[in-house]
Each structure stands twice: as structure tokens, then as C-alpha cells.
């Protein structure tokens, strides 16, 4: 709040703008008849230094010259870059109570002369764009610095534009508002940037360019594709381009891909035939343009065209599996399962599957279409049956896949040996086996089939399977494998007309079960105790249960309990024990064991056998 210097003046030598590292002398002078009213000799002029409106120093000790009561000169040094405010105040020393009165103030700017601008780069976006140049201004000057961009061209044409940098804005780019037409393709242009501020000036080196050097074509627009005869693999890509474009680059990829197919097209005139597209696939297409075969810059990529190629008839064969269940003495239920074709084989939306069951000798044929990936029929148990399935989309059907219906586990000689299941990691299980020892006929293929061992899984969930060539003896199963779940795994060996299988349980990761089995009843029969239990709920098993343990001890005894270990079988839910004394009260409980350890004990039951013990 300086009152426009009524009391006096402040001047700076050599100037209010000084280079970094320089000193300045600030003189504060009172106007005639101004000052302390009664005692001019008591006038004391003080100089205060402010940075960002904060008082940082009283320069009382920097006084280099003093006309008592009239003027004082102060030397200021070590000023930092930017602006510093100095305020001169009058202190009437006879009046201690009155604060010093502002006389006048001055701002000193400290900065540097501009460096020559460097790295000039000019562009004109499109044939109708304007020339814009950018440059590197070098070190910040901390002063208002004016920049002039000057362009010189053929016929001595020149033009220029100006801007400035200060502490609020930076000037390192200017648009000249000039458009260079293509008929200047051979001409040379020169640009130069000049920087000037209160401490000096500098000029860039001249930067020379041609039309082709700086004109970046606009990206192509209005991109579209026409599929020849609704083909899913061939299409003509079309687009609009600026008139002078001679070279295009096309890139396209399926939407889920990570690598582009690239094509260069010379004199395409907005049209290019593509012949290697995948049917029924979402594609992304982009195009870039260039004005000259050897020189010039590529345009930015166009906006993406996203479209799906048309369908074509399915290729490839379905992977089929089946289950057989006898219903009564003359009927069996056949459940067929198949895996969906992958997109590159389906080549369209699969509308339905054509399923055929045929009795080979009597020529009985059952046919149906379904939209599901399974089909169940009841057929006679007699005769040799074969099944076939094909997939259909809007353009046609795949070749049918045939499979002979045999008794999958009917031939013991075909059963694979030494089947093992090892957990590889959280998501898969490695199954290995040895071939059947005395197979009558050659193994055509192995099928590894697995299903979660949970209630109702046979009826609720289709099986998972892998087809393995006959010379392979291992399979890594991962589809729908979850940790802490026990799977029944079957390895089938199939010949032309027979099948044999071996079964094993396995898990990909295991923990000790959460709880033990629940003893539901203890009954005494013929001097033996039968312990009955309910199995541990499926979510609490946490892997494959290897065996159960039945513990017992005399009530109130502190001795170690006795135990009996039973191999786990799903179908078993009772077991006899016969080493208990009659008319002694026992406490019994059970635990379950996985490969990771033993569960906590289940419920305790007390029982006092009545009969005679062994």
C-alpha cells in the first residue's frame, strides 16, 4: 500500500532490471518540505526488502551514502532470480510510538539474457493446415522475453509472428497462419527465432525445410469395408484421403490380438483388397498416409474402423465323449457330450448341432438337433452303436465326428496301469499311467476324464475330458480344476471296439479338513461295535480324504486313545471295531486325513458295550 510516492522518490542504478550476480544501488530521496515535521535532522530513511509480499530484510546496514534527513543510498547484492520489492520508509526517531511511514518503492527484476532458441521444428497438418513451429527456449530468463518467429520463402516472401514468455506463460510455439500449397513441393523455406529481453537478445540458427519435410497429411477418414460376396476372408477396404497422398500404410488386427498385420499400398487411391481375414472375427482397421514415396512424414493413424467379418461354414471336428448307464436288463442311457468349436473353427455363431445315433447292423437311426453341447437318449442294450455330431452356423455345417459306443470300462485287459495323480500347482493336476499289460487289441487313444467328487456331480455337471494319443502316458488337466477340491479321475484306454479304465482321486492343492466325520450311531452286533457316520460336508473336506480314523478311550482316562484307520471309500459309512471291553464306558470320535494332515476331531459319542468282548 504505497501512496503513489507523495513523500519522495526511489531510483535504481544501473537499472531496475539487472543480470544475476550484479549489485544495484537504490536511492531514496524525500521531496522538499517532506519528512519529520519538527526535526529534519531526525529523518531516518530505511529500506525494506520484500519477496512474495513477505518482509525478508531491513537493509539498514547496507547504507552506502547518506544526506542526513534528505536522501539515502543503499547497495543491494545477492539478489535471487525473479522480482524483489524494495520499500523506502521514513522513521521519525523522536516519535517512538509512530510506525515508519512509506515513502516510495521499486521492483528490481533479476534475470538472464535469453539463450539462442534451438531445435526448431515446424509442421503443417494437412494440405490446408497452417505452418506452426516450436522450439526450445533454453534456460528460463525470469524476465519478460519476446520471441519472434520469422519465415522466409520463395520470391523473397517473409512473414513473422510474436509471443512472449513471463512468469505466467511460456512461449515456445507459434502458428504463422500461413498455408503452404503443394505446388511449393520443391521450394525451400527458412525459419529463424529471435529472443529479446531487457538484458540482451539472441537468434537461432536458420532452420531450412521443404514442403515435404513439414507437411503431415491429415489422417484418412470415412473408412469402410466391403466384403466380396459376403466372404468372411476377403474384403475391400476403402477410405478418403487428401489429394496429394501417394503412399498408405494399413494395419489391422483381430480385437483381442496384440500384433498388427501391416501393409504398404502405393497409389491406392483410397482402396485396397485384403485376402487373409478370419471369418466371423471382430477386426480393427487403421490407415496412415504419406505425400511422397521417399520423403515426408506419415500422418497420424486414422480413427479405427471396427467391424466383424461375415460368417463362413464351420471347419474342424468336434471333440465327442459319452457316458453309458444301464437302466434295466434290456435298456441303456447314452449321454453324449461335445466341446464347443473354438472361434477359428466355428467361423460364425453355432446355431445348432446335428446328432445321430445309429445301430450299425440293424440300420436303426436316431437323429435330432440341439442347441446344447450334450444329448441323452435311451436305447437298447443290444447291438453295436455309433454316434456322430456336427455343428451348424448360418453358412453350413462342419463334417460330422463319429465315435463308437463301447463299454468304457468293460475290458479289464485294457485298463491302464499305475495311474497316479500329482498336484502341479493350484490350477492343475498331472496324471500319469502305464499302458495296459495284455491288451488284445491296439489302444487307439486314451481319454482322461475328471469330475468333482461332490454330491450330485454326475447328474448336475458334464464330465471334463482330454483326448491323448496312444503313445503318450501323461496328461496335465487344468480345465475347471480348483484348489481344495477332490476329483475323480479316470483314464480310459479305447480300442476300435473295446474300452478299459482305471480310476484315481486327485486334487491340485489340499489342506487338512475343517472338521471330522459326525458319528451318527454306535450299534452292537454279535460282540462287535458298528460305528456309523456321515461324511464331512463337501466344502469342508479341502482336498481328497485319504482315510478316516476312529479313536476311542475309556471315559475319564488320561491314557492315549486307541485308533483304527480306515481307507476312505465314498460308499462306506460304517465300520466295525472289536477290541472294546464290555460294561466299560468309552468315548469315541473320528477324524479325517488328507495329504496335508488330520482334521480336528468330530463329535464325541459315549458307548458302553454290553456283550462279551474278544
Amino acid at each position: 500500500n504505497i501512496d503513489v510516492c507523495k513523500l519522495g522518490t526511489v531510483t535504481v542504478q544501473p537499472a531496475p532490471v539487472i543480470p544475476l550476480g550484479s549489485a544495484a544501488n537504490i536511492s531514496c530521496s524525500l521531496n522538499p518540505k517532506q519528512g519529520c515535521s519538527h526535526y529534519p535532522s531526525s529523518n531516518e530513511l530505511i529500506l525494506l526488502k520484500f519477496v512474495n509480499d513477505v518482509l525478508v530484510e531491513n537493509l539498514h546496514g547496507k547504507k552506502v551514502h547518506d544526506h542526513t534527513g534528505h536522501s539515502s543510498t543503499f547497495q543491494v547484492t545477492n539478489l535471487s532470480l525473479g522480482m524483489t520489492l524494495f520499500v523506502c520508509k521514513l522513521n521519525c526517531s523522536n516519535s517512538q510510538k509512530k510506525p515508519p511511514v512509506p515513502v516510495c518503492g521499486v521492483e528490481i527484476s533479476v534475470g538472464v539474457a535469453p539463450e539462442p532458441p534451438q531445435n526448431i521444428s515446424c509442421v503443417q497438418e494437412g494440405e490446408n493446415g497452417t505452418v506452426a513451429c516450436s522450439w526450445n527456449s533454453g534456460k528460463v530468463t525470469y524476465l519478460k522475453t519476446n520471441y519472434t518467429l520469422q519465415l522466409s520463402g520463395p520470391n523473397n516472401l517473409t512473414c513473422q509472428k510474436q509471443c512472449f514468455s513471463d512468469n505466467r506463460q511460456n512461449c515456445n510455439r507459434l502458428d504463422l497462419g500461413i498455408n503452404l500449397s503443394p505446388d511449393l513441393a520443391e521450394s525451400r523455406f527458412i525459419v529463424r527465432v529471435t529472443a529479446i529481453n531487457d538484458l540482451g537478445n539472441s537468434s537461432s540458427l536458420p532452420h531450412t525445410f521443404t514442403f515435404l519435410d513439414i507437411v503431415i497429411p491429415l489422417p484418412p477418414w470415412d473408412i469402410r469395408i466391403n466384403f466380396l460376396n459376403a466372404s468372411g476372408s476377403r474384403g475391400t477396404l476403402q477410405w478418403e484421403d487428401e489429394g496429394q497422398v501417394v503412399l498408405n500404410q494399413l494395419r489391422y488386427q483381430p480385437l483381442n490380438s496384440t500384433s498388427w498385420n501391416m501393409v504398404n499400398a502405393t497409389n491406392a487411391k483410397g482402396k485396397y483388397d485384403l485376402r487373409d481375414l478370419r471369418p466371423f472375427t471382430e477386426y480393427e482397421f487403421q490407415i496412415s498416409s504419406k505425400l511422397h514415396l521417399s520423403g515426408g512424414s506419415w500422418s497420424n493413424w486414422s480413427e479405427s474402423l471396427r467391424t466383424r467379418t461375415p460368417e463362413e461354414e464351420p471347419v474342424g471336428i468336434l471333440d465327442i465323449w459319452y457316458m453309458k448307464q444301464d437302466i434295466d436288463y434290456d435298456r441303456q442311457q447314452i449321454s453324449l457330450f461335445w466341446k464347443s468349436l473354438n472361434p477359428s473353427e466355428a467361423r460364425g455363431k453355432i446355431l445348432h448341432y446335428q446328432v445321430t445315433l445309429q445301430e450299425v447292423t440293424k440300420k436303426t437311426t436316431l437323429q435330432n438337433t440341439t442347441r446344447h453341447t450334450s444329448w441323452t437318449r435311451v436305447i437298447p442294450r443290444t447291438g453295436a452303436w455309433t454316434a456322430s455330431v456336427s455343428a451348424a452356423n448360418s453358412k453350413g455345417a462342419s463334417a460330422p465326428t463319429h465315435i463308437n459306443i463301447v463299454d468304457l470300462c468293460g475290458t479289464g485287459l485294457l485298463a491302464p496301469h499305475q495311474v497316479s495323480a500329482k498336484s502341479e500347482n493350484m490350477d492343475n493336476i498331472l496324471v500319469t499311467w502305464q499302458p495296459p499289460k495284455k491288451a488284445d487289441s491296439a489302444v487307439r487313444e486314451y481319454i482322461v476324464e475328471w469330475r468333482a467328487l461332490q454330491p450330485g456331480s454326475i447328474t448336475k455337471f458334464p464330465p471334463h475330458w482330454l483326448r491323448i494319443p496312444p503313445d503318450n502316458m501323461s496328461a496335465l488337466i487344468s480345465e475347471n480344476i480348483k484348489p481344495y477340491i477332490c476329483y475323480e479321475i479316470r483314464v480310459h484306454a479305447l480300442s476300435e471296439s473295446q474300452g478299459g479304465c482305471s480310476s484315481i482321486r486327485g486334487d491340485s492343492k489340499h489342506k487338512a479338513p475343517v472338521s471330522g466325520p459326525h458319528i451318527t450311531a454306535i450299534t452292537e452286533k454279535k460282540e462287535r461295535l458298528f460305528i456309523s457316520w456321515t461324511h464331512i460336508p463337501f466344502p469342508e473336506q479341502r482336498g481328497c480324504i485319504l482315510h478316516y480314523r476312529i479313536y476311542w478311550k475309556e471315559r475319564d482316562s488320561t491314557a492315549q486313545p486307541e485308533l483304527c484307520e480306515i481307507q476312505y471309500r465314498r460308499s462306506q459309512n460304517s465300520h466295525p471295531i472289536s477290541s472294546l471291553q464290555p460294561r466299560v464306558t468309552y468315548v469315541l470320535w473320528m477324524t479325517a486325513v488328507t495329504a496335508a494332515g488330520e482334521s480336528p476331531q468330530g463329535n464325541e459319542r459315549e458307548f458302553c458295550p454290553q456283550g462279551k468282548a474278544n
Epitope: 497452417t130 520463402g153 520463395p154 520470391n155 523473397n156 516472401l157 517473409t158 512473414c159 513473422q160 509472428k161 510474436q162 497462419g177 500461413i178 498455408n179 503452404l180 500449397s181 505446388d183 511449393l184 521450394s187
Partner: nanobody
Framework: QVQLQESGGGSVQAGGSLRLSCAAS????????MGWFRQAPGKEREGVAA????????YYADSVKDRFTISQDNAKNTLYLQMNSLTPEDTAMYYC????????????????????WGQGTQVTVS
């Protein structure tokens, strides 16, 4: 809206002088190319002289060098063409053009490059 208004045309004897003016309105005058063009009946429009208002560079057609002078008055937003030693070949409609925003190989002489045009003023030399 930019408007260019020419004045100062008329009839004059061979060897005489005329001074054409072009008043620009609705227009930022600095750092622009402004030019004078002429078109005789049945002929193409040709560049006579041009000036760059940002730096004072001037350009002249060979046929008028040393006879015509182009100048400007920034304060009045006005462009001038002083024509001395006029000949019957100088007879034409004279147009004022402003803002050379598209550079062709003809440079300042190419009328396609200018953004704004006046209605013209007739000069007849007998």
C-alpha cells in the same frame, strides 16, 4: 466482418499520376501481407505490388518498378498505391487484397493465396 474499400481511381492522361487507397475494417492490420492487383478486360488478374505490414517488406512487379510505390498507414488501417508515369498499359480495374494465407509458387503475385478482396476501382489512362 472484414471489408476492404478501394478509392482514388479515375481517368488520367499518359504520364500522369494517381494515388489509390484501400481502407480496411474489421481486420487486425499488423503482420499481414496486403497487395494491389489489377485486371484488364480479357486478361488474368495480375499482382502489381505487395507489402508485409509486420516488417515493411515490399514487392513489385517488373512492369511497375520505379513507377509505383506501395505504402501503409497503420494508424488509419489504410493501404496506398502511388502510381506515377502512367501509360495506357496501366489501364485496368485495380483491386486491394489482404491476408496472404496460402503461399503458392507464384508467391505474393498469386491471387489464390489472398483471403480478402475489395470491390475494385477503375483506372483509365489515355
Amino acid at each position: 466482418q472484414v471489408q476492404l474499400q478501394e478509392s482514388g481511381g479515375g481517368s488520367v492522361q499518359a504520364g500522369g499520376s494517381l494515388r489509390l487507397s484501400c481502407a480496411a475494417s474489421g481486420y487486425t492490420y499488423s503482420n499481414r501481407h496486403m497487395g494491389w492487383f489489377r485486371q484488364a478486360p480479357g486478361k488474368e488478374r495480375e499482382g502489381v505490388a505487395a507489402i508485409y505490414t509486420g516488417g515493411g517488406s515490399t514487392y513489385y512487379a517488373d512492369s511497375v518498378k520505379d513507377r509505383f510505390t506501395i505504402s501503409q498507414d497503420n494508424a488509419k488501417n489504410t493501404l496506398y498505391l502511388q502510381m506515377n508515369s502512367l501509360t495506357p498499359e496501366d489501364t485496368a480495374m485495380y483491386y486491394c487484397a489482404a491476408d496472404l494465407t496460402r503461399w503458392y509458387s507464384g508467391g505474393w503475385r498469386d491471387p489464390r493465396g489472398y483471403k480478402y478482396w475489395g470491390q475494385g476501382t477503375q483506372v483509365t489512362v489515355s
